[in-house]
């Protein structure tokens, strides 16, 4: 988790002097509770936005927006703590809006936004906005949270972001798999424009089951430049196991930008359709 570019972050708006500070996620008001605390944020909204760094890279960011309730507690509102928790790693990043002037009611509802938390493809985050000072131990909570799921690199808008392109999102191998005679599979896919090796991972399963009955790995050496964007054809020999008929073919590239952590593409071959009622085999041959 990180912030997009550490350039001056702004939270001031007409009628309010405000500065954005790094935060330890442990506001002082936890340790030294105050008697009077503000109410919770209203209408917390999160959207996925895209922002360019100063270097021109494009990153997905969480756009966080909320409004204030129209009650007198805004007189005691000193700022807000924004927290983003990545759920699969438990990593947390916080910033603090510090109000340098007192808020006053005005003709429209106060609204705040922040769009600098960089998020990763296919990750889930808990986004929390805490009004400051935080409540006394038994006080009503004055925060709002939402669990936000970021689309993966298959998503059309995500595909062109720097983290997705680095993991090979622009490569479309257009995999085709056909079953040949004599227990063989013919796998065909389009090579990318990089001299790097690939790996084909074959996993076979029985018709209706999910535990594998056959696994095989096939190495494809790095193509020469004249082979870039050409089709690569590979014939894989299967184990002659009755009923081991559903095959998943996965192609793993090893691009220089992602090494052994590149996006993999897969295709599946289903078992051949079984007739509902098999034709009975006669145990005698009629003579007429």
């Amino acid at each position: 988790l990180r912030l997009l570019d550490h350039r001056a972050l702004v939270c001031s708006q007409p009628g309010l002097n405000c500065t954005v500070k790094n935060s330890t996620c442990l506001d002082d008001s936890w340790i030294h509770p105050r008697n009077l605390t503000p109410s919770s944020p209203k209408d917390l909204q999160i959207q996925l936005h895209f922002a360019h760094t100063q270097q021109g890279d494009l990153f997905p960011v969480a756009h966080i927006e909320w409004t204030l309730q129209t009650d007198a507690s805004i007189l005691y509102l000193e700022g807000a703590e924004l927290s983003v928790l990545q759920l699969n790693t438990n990593e947390r990043l916080c910033v603090r809006f510090e109000f340098l002037s007192k808020l006053r009611h005005h003709h429209r509802r106060w609204r705040f936004t922040f769009s600098h938390f960089v998020v990763d493809p296919d990750q889930e985050y808990e986004v929390t906005v805490h009004h400051l000072p935080k409540p006394i131990p038994d006080g009503d909570p004055n925060h709002q949270s939402k669990n936000f799921l970021v689309p993966d690199c298959e998503h059309a808008r995500m595909k062109v972001t720097t983290p997705c392109m680095s993991s090979g999102s622009l490569w479309d191998p257009n995999i085709t798999v056909e079953t040949l005679e004599a227990h063989q599979l013919r796998v065909s896919f389009t090579l990318w424009n990089e001299s790097t090796h690939y790996q084909i991972l074959l996993t076979s399963f029985p018709h209706m089951e999910n535990h594998s009955c056959f696994e095989h790995m096939h190495h494809i050496p790095a193509p020469r430049p004249e082979e870039f964007h050409q089709r690569s054809n590979v014939t894989l020999t299967l184990r002659n196991l009755k009923g081991c008929c559903r095959h998943q073919v996965q192609i793993q590239p090893f691009f220089s930008s992602c090494l052994n952590d590149c996006l993999r593409h897969s295709a599946t071959v289903s078992c051949p359709e079984m007739p509902d009622t098999p034709e009975p085999i006669p145990d005698y041959m009629p003579l007429w």
Partner: nanobody, 126 residues
């Protein structure tokens, strides 16, 4: 322009099933999370279920969990709600709604629903 058209509602007996459909047009359907929201007679709007852009993540309101199944077919620009074991309290006008922003939030919308269908009426009564 964006259009969401629901269908499949009707009168059904308690314990029976119904399948709602929502046909979407005028936007890139597979970019956005989609939701079902209902409004019972004399009640407010209640979020029912949501599904992420590719169908990979799904969430339900506690009141319908285990009975309703949301799904989508991006090739057909369609959203579905399979409703089983229907109860009288499921009687409502069911709306299909589009998430305004990209991304998906559990327990409802991340931001707001910027487009709604006209609704399809489901009546559960014996």
């Amino acid at each position: 322009q964006v259009q969401l058209v629901e269908s499949g509602g009707g009168l059904v007996q308690p314990g029976r099933s119904l399948r709602l459909s929502c046909a979407a047009s005028g936007f890139t359907f597979d970019d956005y999370a989609m939701h079902w929201v209902r409004q019972g007679p004399g009640k407010g709007l209640e979020w029912v279920s949501g599904i992420s852009w590719n169908g990979g993540t799904i969430d339900y309101a506690d009141s319908v969990k285990g009975r309703f199944t949301i799904s989508r077919d991006n090739a057909k620009n369609s959203l579905y709600l399979q409703m089983n074991s229907l109860r009288p309290e499921d009687t409502a006008l069911y709306y299909c709604a589009k998430e305004e922003g990209l991304g998906f939030c559990r327990g409802g919308s991340c931001s707001t629903f910027d487009y709604w269908g006209q609704g399809t009426l489901v009546t559960v009564s014996s």
